[in-house]
């Protein structure tokens, strides 16, 4: 189902989309997630607020929690303990960073209806959790952490030396957070809860990034943050495990890193419990082209957890760096020792691979010309994966069942032939034993999201269909959106082009690039949105492209891999050998084109406009890195080795902006920030307009007080409002 | 070990109301979960409401505000009230026990069961 792009005979009463739409989220789809409690059963906060249990054998639903008790404390999110007999419910949400947030928790009693009195939790809790089986609790308070036996319990404390900035235990610091797990927790219970195991985070020799936060005090605050920028002194991690039945007995054991990691700086990656007594966790090199994975098991004689060499497996990239954003994740098989993994195959091209004994004995389990993405669930006789194989587009995702059981393997796709035209890009989300799953259909139609029968791959219901937005849509005249692929030099360019409603190839139109262009990132992607830029080809008429050039990702190494330690290249270079391709297509006013983007893509942004190709009009940068140096080091290092002489450094050197600050004078150029930023630091657009000052030349730049790398609440419309004059302006397009 | 006997089912009309009971043995009954479920010719078994040993009830969405679960420990029995009786209430309804929480929909988390009582309802 795609909503109506032609023209119908009621075409007087179709109207384009407004900014004010995008703005108020008019046009906004849900998705429905199923928190899966069993084979088939899962829970969903219903639009009430009541906490509904689903039993997908009988039909039946079951309030298992009233919208009543959760207003009574405030909640916004609850947990259901795996013994059923309490929920935890979250209120006073504060944000940190991206994934990060502190909360106060209150343990609700379904037993008798009460909420646990005595040894009550501290506030405010960093991060908390239940075990998977029972109801033992562990928590993170003032980056210490604690465990209860149970809810009632009084909280036996396991770290003490936990201290704001310095040791972080059980959560991760800021380049942890944002770079290498990501997740806002760094603890892990083992399958029935018997260990706990969890990160420290030593950032005491870690340079800080100090702001202002101007609030509204007479004298504004400085946040300070350990952030490791490239090339700085980087967290020292250390994995501990804790036996949670006996935790005074022997107390938290270190788990050993491989000799071949600890000789260097080194990052710890992720940690993956395989049974009760054997743990897997992966090492990275500092410089990240060598990944390491340590199985280790337990010893009851000395309570200690051993990590045989001949149980470590190598990951090494000769191209690049190891893996594609972050080094895959194992995901282990009943037998508790192979595991299935994606990496590089010989040809250069993300695929799963089966590793019983050694990585150069894996068993090749997908391949071709075209990548596995993500293993969903290993069960004992099927694999589920997706990949963007169907009809060699990059921009997909199916979801495919393998069947592990038989030789030779099966392979069928399960979502490839459900909803051809509306559902091209999918995510899955299975119960226990992959009993049931639902489907999560993105697009390139209005989202939907079902629910599956897990042996005969059967829709069974729809979870969510949206119908209130397609509805809306009836009477919009959207843009017509095209993903193709341009052949430049052996290089393959997909690009997405969003066109007028009454787009008409003879006339000209302003052209506005979109770009992103990060490494191991993809913005030409099936999916459905109603966004600011769906506004401008709807209303006023612009034409839109998003390209994806060397560095993107899904598209096997060669194109992944063709920035490494060259940032800001090759990027730049695909972007304007596009736009020359849009150009030849005859429809493109080459007086009248333009280029934005926010983040990496304010940093490609900024050099397109100074490349001096003459190309572009005008252009937005939107919290653009503006020289690598100033970014994190676990980020720019991955893709750039380190800033010193006899590695990079000359590189760093010619890739900033500010190096080009001369090729401005002939753009106009709208630079935009925000001064709390805490992921791209302000620091990056004040050294562009520094820069541009010096040079004399002139630009336009907006900043945006207290306001994070996400520019949002009223900033957002601000912002969009502001962006829309600006490009108006330089497009001649009346207001 | 709980053994349980229900009672009080019937033929009854639409709108009218049926009082199931389910006696208990055994001295720890007051630790129990309890739960009534009912199953139609050709239709899986299904949770019809569950009580904790706590007095805690929920329901299923189907019969809320129609059915209402109680307990009485002294007298180790569960008693389910049922109301408004429509002809799609009709069903074998069985009592079921377990240890921990009551909120368990499945019928295979639920150890223990009584024989079943036949609750017929005419349009």
């Known amino acids: 189902l795609r909503p109506s792009r032609v023209h119908n005979s009621e075409e007087n009463t179709m109207r384009a989309l407004t900014l004010k739409d995008i703005l108020n989220g008019t046009f906004s789809y849900k998705t429905f997630f199923p928190n899966w409690i069993s084979g088939q059963e899962y829970l969903h906060q219903s639009a009430d607020n009541n906490i509904v249990l689903y039993n997908i054998e009988t039909g039946q639903s079951y309030t298992i929690l009233s919208n009543r008790t959760m207003k009574s404390v405030n909640a916004s999110n609850y947990g259901l303990s795996p013994d059923r007999q309490f929920v935890y419910l979250e209120s006073d949400y504060s944000k940190l960073w991206r994934y990060s947030y502190t909360a106060t928790y209150y343990i609700y009693d379904l037993s008798n209806g009460e909420f646990v009195r005595g040894n009550e939790l501290p506030r405010p809790i960093q991060y908390l959790c239940w075990s998977p089986v029972g109801s033992k609790l562990a928590y993170v308070y003032q980056n210490n952490i604690y465990l209860k036996q149970r809810p009632g319990d009084p909280p036996f404390q396991i770290t003490f030396n936990g201290r704001e900035n310095k040791i972080f235990n059980g959560i991760p610091d800021w380049v942890y957070e944002e770079e290498m797990l990501p997740t806002k927790y760094a603890l892990w219970w083992s399958p029935n809860g018997k260990f706990l195991a969890y990160a420290e985070f030593n950032d005491k020799d870690i340079p800080v990034i100090a702001y202002s936060y101007y609030g509204d005090e007479q004298y504004p605050r400085t946040i300070n943050i350990p952030y490791p920028k490239a090339g700085a002194k980087n967290p020292v991690v250390r994995i501990f495990i804790i036996d949670t039945t006996y935790p005074a007995y022997v107390g938290p054991q270190e788990v050993p890193v491989p000799a071949m990691i600890a000789s260097s700086d080194y990052y710890f990656s992720w940690l993956t419990w395989v049974t009760d007594e054997r743990v897997c966790l992966q090492w990275l090199k500092r410089v990240q082209n060598v990944s390491v994975l340590s199985i280790c098991d337990f010893r009851e004689d000395w309570q200690t957890w051993d990590c045989p060499k001949t149980q470590e497996h190598i990951e090494e990239s000769r191209t690049g760096w190891a893996g594609g954003f972050f080094v895959s994740r194992p995901v282990f098989s009943y037998d508790a020792i192979s595991y299935y993994k994606i990496f590089s195959d010989k040809d250069g091209y993300k695929h799963i691979h089966y590793i019983k004994d050694t990585v150069e004995n894996a068993i090749q389990i997908t391949s071709g010309k075209w990548e596995a993405i993500n293993i969903f669930r290993v069960t004992q006789d099927s694999l589920f994966y997706s990949s963007n194989e169907f009809e060699e587009y990059p921009g997909r995702r199916n979801i495919y069942r393998i069947s592990i059981g038989s030789y030779p393997p099966s392979k069928k796709c399960v979502t490839c032939h459900l909803r051809k035209e509306r559902c091209q890009y999918y995510t899955a989300s299975f119960s226990d034993y992959a009993k049931y799953y639902a489907l999560v259909c993105y697009g390139p139609g209005i989202p939907i999201s079902t629910l599956h029968d897990g042996r005969t791959d059967q829709e069974i219901k729809i979870l969510e269909e949206n119908k209130e937005l397609e509805n809306a849509l009836k009477n919009i005249q959207l843009p017509k959106e095209e993903i193709k692929k341009l052949e430049v030099d052996e290089i393959t360019l997909w690009y997405k082009m969003i066109l007028p409603p009454q787009f008409d190839r003879s006339k000209k139109y302003p052209l506005l690039i979109q770009v992103y262009g990060g490494p191991c990132s993809q913005s030409v992607r099936s999916v459905f949105a109603v966004n600011w830029i769906s506004y401008l080809a709807s209303k006023e008429g612009m034409v839109i492209a998003l390209v994806d050039g060397r560095g993107t990702a899904f598209q096997g190494d060669k194109l992944l891999y063709a920035v490494y330690r060259k940032l800001g290249v090759y990027e730049v270079e695909d972007q304007i050998t596009a736009v020359r391709k849009f150009i030849e297509m005859g429809f493109i006013d080459e007086k009248r084109i333009a280029i934005w983007g926010w983040s990496y893509g304010g940093y490609v942004s900024s050099l397109a406009l100074a490349s001096g190709t003459g190309l572009f009009k005008c252009g937005i940068a939107v919290a653009p890195v503006s020289s690598w140096e100033y970014y994190a080091s676990v980020y720019t290092e991955r893709f750039m080795g380190l800033p010193t002489k006899d590695d990079n450094l000359e590189h760093y050197k010619n890739s900033t902006v500010m190096a080009r600050a001369e090729y401005f004078r002939n753009v106009d150029y709208l630079l935009i920030h925000g001064t709390a930023d805490d992921n791209v630091h302000f620091q990056n657009s004040a050294q562009i307009a520094k820069a541009l000052v010096n040079a004399q030349v002139d630009f336009q730049a907006m900043w945006y007080s207290d306001q994070n790398h996400g520019l949002s609440g009223l900033s957002t419309n601000h912002l969009y409002t502001h962006m829309t004059h600006f490009l108006k302006q330089c497009f001649s397009l009346s207001d | 070990q709980v053994q349980l006997q229900e009672s009080g089912g019937g033929l009854v009309q639409a709108g009218g109301s049926l009082r199931l009971s389910c006696a208990a043995s055994?001295?720890?009954?007051?630790?129990?979960?309890m739960g009534w479920f009912r199953q139609a010719p050709g239709k899986e078994r299904e949770l019809v409401a569950a009580i904790s040993n706590g007095g805690s009830a929920y329901y299923a969405d189907s019969v809320k505000g129609r059915f209402t679960i109680s307990r009485d420990n002294a007298r180790n029995t569960v008693y389910l009230q049922t109301n408004s009786l429509k002809p799609e209430d009709t069903a074998v309804y069985y009592c079921?026990?377990?240890?921990?929480?009551?909120?368990?929909?499945?019928?295979?988390?639920?150890?223990?069961w009584g024989q079943g009582t036949q609750v017929t309802v005419s349009s």
């Open positions: 055994g001295r720890t009954f007051s630790t129990y979960a």
């Open positions: 079921a026990a377990r240890r921990g929480s009551a909120y368990y929909t499945n019928r295979i988390d639920w150890p223990y």
